[in-house]
Amino acid sequence: TKTESSSRGPYHPSECCFTYTTYKIPRQRIMDYYETNSQCSKPGIVFITKRGHSVCTNPSDKWVQDYIKDMKEN
């Protein structure tokens, strides 16, 4: 089983999200995204910015779902 990383904040997660950012990331700064492993204690969508930063976000936030739809369409 995959172990959760020791990353405790919303930034630079290596495996799982323990907390989520409270800020909406501007869409133009986002390059890609991935969903955290289903074995993590909390679900998470990790957005990768153009500067290479990874940010944990809450899938239940509307802007997160909107961004995912936009990136899938494009």
Partner: antibody
Framework: CQSVKESEGGLFKPTDTLTLTCTVS????????INWVRQAPGEGLQYIGW???????YYASWAKSRSTITRNTNENTVTLKMTSLTAADTATYFC???????????????WGQGTLVTVSS | AVVLTQTASPVSAPVGGTVTINCQAS??????LAWYQQKPGQPPKLLIY???TLASGVPSRFKGSGSGTEFTLTISDLECADAATYSC????????FGGGTEVVVK
């Protein structure tokens, strides 16, 4: 008129599998999320999981190992399946719509009346 | 997980009076807090989200305030129909609910 309605619950035995269906009317499953929440007798509300407008399902940590949420957009239904029932799963189960107008799909504006599920041998 | 602790039940006040219900989060949840009203045998009804924004159709007698870890729901000009259990919900992190606070209108 927008509404959601849960299917009938009933009496289950320990180790049984629960299947509940939420039927939505007056709105599309593509326009919001459906949450499942339960409430044990005399207790507070407990989140189980939800399915997004694009069909991705997410679960509370306690529920994810034995819960599955799916949807049928043709029939406007969302199904909750929960395996390995125990007496602790005795509760009223609600489905509720989150339209995202609050900025978050966990905030739910339309609730079903709920259906009672009793687990007993 | 975030734990929400609410004012102990019951809280009582006369018709026309004011009640205040507190909800304390175990860690900061910014303003990601909602309040629901629930009457026996009925589903919850959304009152407030974003800690202070009234949901559609909710009278202005209901007022939410707070941010971070301390939140308050104030009901003024109490009516008999306000007798119910009120629950807070955090939607920043884990989607947890408080245990509920029963309001009795005398």
């Amino acid at each position: 008129c927008q509404s959601v309605k849960e299917s009938e619950g009933g009496l289950f035995k320990p180790t049984d599998t629960l299947t509940l269906t939420c039927t939505v009317s007056g709105f599309s499953l593509y326009s919001g999320a459906i949450n499942w929440v339960r409430q044990a007798p005399g207790e507070g509300l407990q989140y189980i999981g939800w399915i997004s407008d694009v069909g991705s399902a997410y679960y509370a940590s306690w529920a994810k190992s034995r819960s599955t949420i799916t949807r049928n957009t043709n029939e406007n239904t969302v199904t909750l399946k929960m395996t390995s029932l125990t007496a602790a799963d005795t509760a009223t189960y609600f489905c509720a719509r989150g339209d995202g107008s609050s900025g978050n799909y966990w905030v739910t504006d339309i609730w079903g009346q709920g259906t009672l599920v009793t687990v007993s041998s | 997980a975030v734990v929400l602790t609410q004012t102990a039940s019951p809280v009582s006040a006369p018709v026309g009076g004011t009640v205040t219900i507190n909800c304390q989060a175990s860690e900061s949840i910014s303003s990601r807090l909602a309040w629901y009203q629930q009457k026996p045998g009925q589903p919850p009804k959304l009152l407030i989200y974003g800690a202070s924004t009234l949901a559609s159709g909710v009278p202005s007698r209901f007022k939410g305030s707070g941010s971070g870890t301390e939140f308050t729901l104030t009901i003024s000009d109490l009516e008999c129909a306000d007798a119910a259990t009120y629950s807070c919900q955090e939607y920043l992190s884990d989607n947890t609910f408080g245990g509920g606070t029963e309001v009795v209108v005398k």
